[in-house]
């Protein structure tokens, strides 16, 4: 056949769907690869063709759109499963073509099994809620387009295995779950099960997301440098190892970049000739506040090094701070020499 623009296997869109549930999968060509939409393509006389490769097979085969109850169908640029089966797992290709044009892309579809508590290998989106912040909501994700607005589905929310109906800080409100006061105890996996009728059948959509309760912007402060501080003096003799930790606390801030760096005599360590190494470690609190420690190390310090200015800097979206370390050369202990003058004076 004639040449076709092949975008290959789009592994960025690793689509996972639950077994025995409806799934609607849009052809990624129009979303990520082409500059026009399906309607434009269709009116220009282009045809969208679907085929697939089963898991652990190399053979591309057409999709069977003649299954009982139209289990698999295509509607515009959407491939529908009503519902999925485990052996629908494979790589799916959508190809847009006419006699003079051809473009195609493949994507992996994995049909996943879940247990009675909604545990599965599904990768879960994470939704962050601010601790004790006021009313916040999560919304049942990826359910648009499954049923018309005239259909009123029933939605049941679960935390882990438990139906949410006896929680005194969480209110189920249809597609939304409202948290009156988010607490650490609200961390966990939340599942919405959407049940709707279609052509005399009942379908269920299961969507699980992870809630992580994080520090509130109301409590956020600029970075706090715990070390170096005014109480610790780094007193060394030439030839000894100099170790200065810079320990900084950062409040959690959504999408903030936290930075810690050292300057030596106002320059970055990379821009200076002395043999200095810096090791960084990061730890997080339960609400994702961050503590970064950068240890500046000079293996064999010289008297010149001990006269330099060592400053720890920190920056977040809340501001920038700096603190100098108190470094000095250890004064050698005085040597007391006892001179014994034994004079046997002649009389």
């Amino acid at each position: 056949s004639e040449r076709c623009d092949d975008w290959g296997l789009d592994t960025m869109r690793q689509i996972q769907v639950f077994e025995d549930e409806p799934a609607r999968i849009k052809c990624p060509l129009f979303e990520h690869f082409l500059k026009f939409n399906y309607s434009t393509a269709h009116s220009a006389g282009l045809t969208l063709i679907w085929y697939w490769t089963r898991q652990d097979r190399d053979l591309e085969e057409p999709i069977n759109f003649r299954l009982p109850e139209n289990r698999i169908s295509k509607e515009k640029d959407v491939l529908w499963f009503r519902p999925t089966l485990l052996n629908d797992t494979g790589n799916y290709t959508c190809m847009l073509r006419n006699t003079t044009y051809c473009s195609k892309v493949a994507f992996p579809l994995e049909v996943v099994q879940k247990d009675s508590c909604f545990n599965s290998p599904m990768k879960l989106p994470v939704h962050k809620l601010y601790i004790e912040y006021g009313i916040q909501r999560i919304t049942c994700p990826n359910v648009d387009g499954y049923f018309p607005s005239s259909v009123k589905p029933t939605i049941t929310w679960y935390m882990g295995c438990y139906k949410i109906q006896n929680f005194n800080n969480v209110i189920p409100e249809g597609m939304n779950l409202s948290f009156l006061i988010a607490l650490i105890s609200n961390n966990g996996n939340y599942t919405c099960v959407v049940t709707y009728p279609e052509n005399g059948r009942t379908f269920h959509l299961t969507r699980t997301l992870t809630v992580k309760v994080v520090g509130s912007p109301k409590n956020a402060v600029p970075p706090v440098i715990h070390s170096p501080n005014d109480h610790v003096v780094y007193e060394k003799e030439p030839g000894e190892e100099l170790l200065i930790p810079c320990t900084v606390y950062f409040s959690f801030l959504m999408d903030s970049r936290n930075e810690v760096w050292w300057t030596i005599d106002g320059k970055k360590p990379d821009d200076i000739t002395i043999d200095v190494t810096i090791n960084e470690s990061i730890s997080h609190s339960r609400t994702e506040d961050e503590t970064r420690t950068q240890i500046l190390s000079i293996k064999k310090v010289t008297s010149e090094d001990l006269k330099r200015s060592y400053v720890c800097h920190a920056r977040s979206a809340k501001g920038e701070v700096a603190k100098a370390a108190k470094v000095k050369q250890k004064v050698p202990a005085p040597r007391y020499t006892v001179e014994l003058a034994c004079g046997f004076g002649a009389t």
Partner: antibody
């Protein structure tokens, strides 16, 4: 036994102030509960006044209660308070304290109420 | 704010009767509705929460149904101890105002015929 007991109800003149107390026993305020004040005017229906989340101190007020009424709690004493200022005749009611009423759960619990009369 | 409209405001019935009380919310409150029973001189008692879940210790002759804006409390066979006033309570949140709204219905008094 798990219970709530209100006190502090009295006859007070219009414009006066009063502080109601609700002592809890059988459960701890350091746990997560909404404790609320609900009132009922003589021969009338129920009306939610204000609530506090015992573990964090977060508060909720009915729109009409904001500014005049203040809810608070003392976790060490396991006691809820309602400070009522600028009292009016229409504040005359039996004031109940109730647990988990803001988001009604099966752990719902009510005290027997204390009568507040605002009259000259 | 939400408004909960209860009907009827009073009803007379006999022991053994099936009694139905309705509560209408001014906006969608999903299933966030409770029913209470109150007898003269007493505190209210929770019967139903989550629109249809029976509170512990409540006889099975009480049942709740509905969601959205229309709710019903049914007593399948009225007993002498059921003569009382019944209240619904609806709850919903408003994310735009960061507030929670709730309201009791005005009450339904069930009296002996």
């Amino acid at each position: 036994e798990v219970q709530l007991e209100e006190s502090g109800g009295d006859l007070v003149q219009p414009g006066g102030s009063l502080r109601l107390s609700c002592a809890a026993s059988g459960f701890s305020f350091s746990s997560n509960y909404w404790i609320c004040w609900v009132r009922q005017a003589p021969g009338k229906g129920l009306e939610l006044v204000s609530c506090i989340y015992t573990s964090t101190g977060n508060t909720w007020y009915a729109s009409w209660a904001k500014g005049r009424f203040t809810i608070s709690r003392d976790n060490s004493k396991n006691t809820l308070y309602l400070q009522m200022n600028s009292l009016r005749a229409e504040d005359t009611a039996v004031y109940f304290c109730a647990r988990d009423l803001l988001v009604v759960t099966s752990f719902n619990l009510w005290g027997q109420g204390t009568l507040v009369t605002v009259s000259s | 704010d939400i408004v909960m409209t209860q009907s009827p405001s009073s009803l007379s019935a006999s022991v053994g009767d099936r009694v139905t009380i309705t509560c209408q919310a001014s906006e969608d409150i999903y299933s966030n509705l409770a029913w209470f029973q109150q007898k003269p001189g007493q505190a209210p008692k929770l019967l139903i929460y989550g629109a249809s879940t029976l509170a512990s210790g409540v006889p099975s002759r009480f049942s709740g149904s509905g969601s959205g804006t229309e709710f019903t409390l049914t007593i399948s066979s009225l007993q002498p101890e059921d003569f009382a006033t019944y209240y619904c309570l609806g709850v919903c949140t408003d994310i735009s105002t960061d507030d929670l709204y709730n309201a009791f219905g005005q009450g339904t008094k069930v009296v002996i015929k």
